[in-house]
Interface confidence: low
């Protein structure tokens, strides 16, 4: 088949004012192609217009939300132009408020477990968009669950490896305009743990301090991990540090947590920063009791 | 705001080379298609050359008349574009702008710099 | 090459008249012509891109028009602003080509 291939870069979802470079690629060789809109909104500048290579587009509105096809030049063909390509569909975002995404039990995943990702919203969109950052496949499609209070969705996703890890985010859109997407929902970093061996976490001057006192968590592996993460149980998000060579050979991190006032148990994780979304299995778990009132000073 | 600022040129003996440098801000410029025109009493505006992006693998076109004679570059980290020119001739005396390339227009310039090449 | 041809290198008139500037392409274009007016201190700008869409900020007095090889430019109403030469381009081969440009002066 002479048929092109036509692609989208960085990608086929595309915030409203960004730019979406379309490149049209003949197996010929021949790299001077015409594009065509199938659907939604006219796009005058694609009309009797014969592009080079690639075309950039934008700054992009709603109205060039939909699906593209290209023809390339074909000396040998009868019309002069190759049968059409693939299909690409573009969709456009922040045409309506975002929705949120969540991870059940959590984001913090176990090699080989299963994580749901629930993305859900006041608005009543009848399809939600679920995408990973830095992918340029076609995000996946999923069917809405509409309610009085809006719509969701749950994915199920697993078993988990490193392949699946990373900073996910949802996006709704109604059925009668299936290419205009709200803005995207906050990122949610999906990481895998349980990769590589736990580090050793430890508490300077103690585990037990006075309300108000500093304390630092020193988080070390004899791994060469680039990055140590902190996380306390029961809250969201992590502290992040860059590990650094000790003389007794060890790669540590310390985290200076300052004056505490509350307590809680802590974990620390090891990572490399080729593969900021796998982590080793969690440290054992270091409680920090905060006892009385802040000394003073 | 946006701004396109050029540097570098001067004057250079015929035969001569000369580098010019374009730095961008205000507008991503590691999506836009860049260009150098030129513009003298004889020849008006001219385009020059262009460089697209990175994932057209930083393809370049130039006109007839600079061809083997100008390089163009681009360093999207920076910024910035630039025109290596060698082997001037009398007839490359003219203001040089750098300006990206969108759709079918060029739709910002900036004050451009002044190379003349005389003996 | 795509000869891109304005007839009138320069042309004098009055703060408030009609000013039509014309441009005549060697080929069809196809509407890939774009206008731009550089101002005395050398600065250039694009005012109108696909023969008759205007640039963000431009005012509402400059309008284009045309198709295959003929195109113009229109300013309604005559401002001291507009005193300054317009280039024609067209963007629909490579390498673009500009016109030779129309000097506007006042009379």
């Known amino acids: 088949q002479d048929k092109p291939f036509l692609s989208a870069w960085p990608g086929t979802v595309v915030s409203e004012g960004q730019h979406v470079t379309l490149q049209c690629r003949s197996r010929l060789g021949f790299n001077e192609f015409s594009l065509s809109k199938e659907d939604g909104m006219p796009v005058p500048e694609l009309y009797n217009r014969i592009f080079r290579n690639s075309f950039l587009m934008g700054p992009v509105t709603p109205a060039h939300a939909g699906t593209y096809r290209c023809c390339s030049s074909h000396p040998h063909s009868p019309t002069g132009w190759s049968a059409p390509s693939n299909p690409v569909v573009i969709m456009v975002t922040g045409v309506h408020r975002k929705p949120s995404l969540l991870a059940h039990p959590g984001p913090l995943v176990k090699s080989g477990e299963t994580v749901i990702l629930q993305c859900w919203s006041d608005v009543r969109f009848e399809r939600f968009l679920l995408h990973r950052e830095g992918i340029t496949e076609d995000p996946l499609r999923l069917v809405g669950q509409l309610h009085d209070a809006g719509s969701q969705v749950n994915y199920s996703m697993g078993p988990m490896t490193p392949a699946l890890a990373g900073t996910y985010r949802c996006f709704g859109s109604v059925t009668h305009l299936p290419y205009e997407l709200s803005a995207p929902s906050d990122p949610l970093d999906i990481v895998v743990v349980g990769l590589y061996g736990k580090p050793s976490l430890s508490a300077q001057p103690g585990p037990t301090v006075q309300a108000g006192e500093n304390v630092t968590l020193s988080c070390s592996s004899r791994s060469l991990f680039d990055i140590y993460h902190l996380s306390r149980e029961a809250e969201a998000g992590e502290l992040r540090l860059t590990a650094v060579l000790r003389v007794n050979g060890t790669f540590q991190a310390n985290f200076p947590l300052g004056p505490v006032t509350h307590g809680g148990n802590y974990r620390c994780f090891g990572s490399f920063r080729a593969l900021p979304h796998a982590w080793s299995d969690p440290s054992d778990p270091l409680p920090v009791s905060v006892t009385g009132n802040s000394r003073n000073l | 705001e946006l701004k396109l600022e050029e540097s570098g040129g001067g004057l250079v003996q015929p035969g001569g080379s000369m580098k010019l440098s374009c730095v961008a801000s205000?507008?991503?410029?590691?999506?836009?298609?860049m260009n150098w025109v030129r513009q003298s009493p004889e020849k008006g505006l001219e385009w020059i050359a262009e460089i697209r992006l990175k994932s057209n693998n930083y393809a370049t076109h130039y006109a007839e008349s600079v061809k083997g004679r100008f390089t163009i570059s681009r360093d999207d980290s920076k910024s910035s574009v630039y025109l290596q020119m060698n082997n001037l001739r009398a007839e490359d005396t003219g203001i040089f702008y750098c300006?990206?390339?969108?759709?079918?227009?060029?739709?910002?310039w900036g004050q451009g710099t002044l190379v003349t090449v005389s003996a | 090459d795509i000869q891109m041809t304005q007839t009138t290198s320069s042309l004098s008139a009055s703060l408030g008249d009609r000013v039509t500037i014309s441009c005549r392409a060697s080929?069809?274009?196809?509407?890939?012509l774009n206008w731009y007016q550089q101002k005395p201190d050398g600065t250039v700008k694009l005012l109108i891109y696909?023969?008759?869409i205007l640039q963000l900020g431009v005012p509402p007095r400059f309008s284009g028009s045309g198709s295959g090889t003929d195109y113009s430019l229109t300013i309604s109403n005559l401002e001291q602003e507009d005193i300054a030469t317009y280039f024609c381009?067209?963007?629909?081969?490579?390498?673009?080509?500009f016109g030779a440009g129309t000097k506007v002066e006042l009379k």
């Open positions: 080929q069809d274009i196809s509407n890939y």
């Open positions: 696909y023969t008759s």
């Open positions: 300006t990206p390339f969108y759709g079918s227009s060029f739709p910002y």
């Open positions: 381009q067209q963007g629909n081969t490579l390498p673009f080509t």
């Open positions: 205000g507008f991503t410029f590691s999506n836009y298609w």
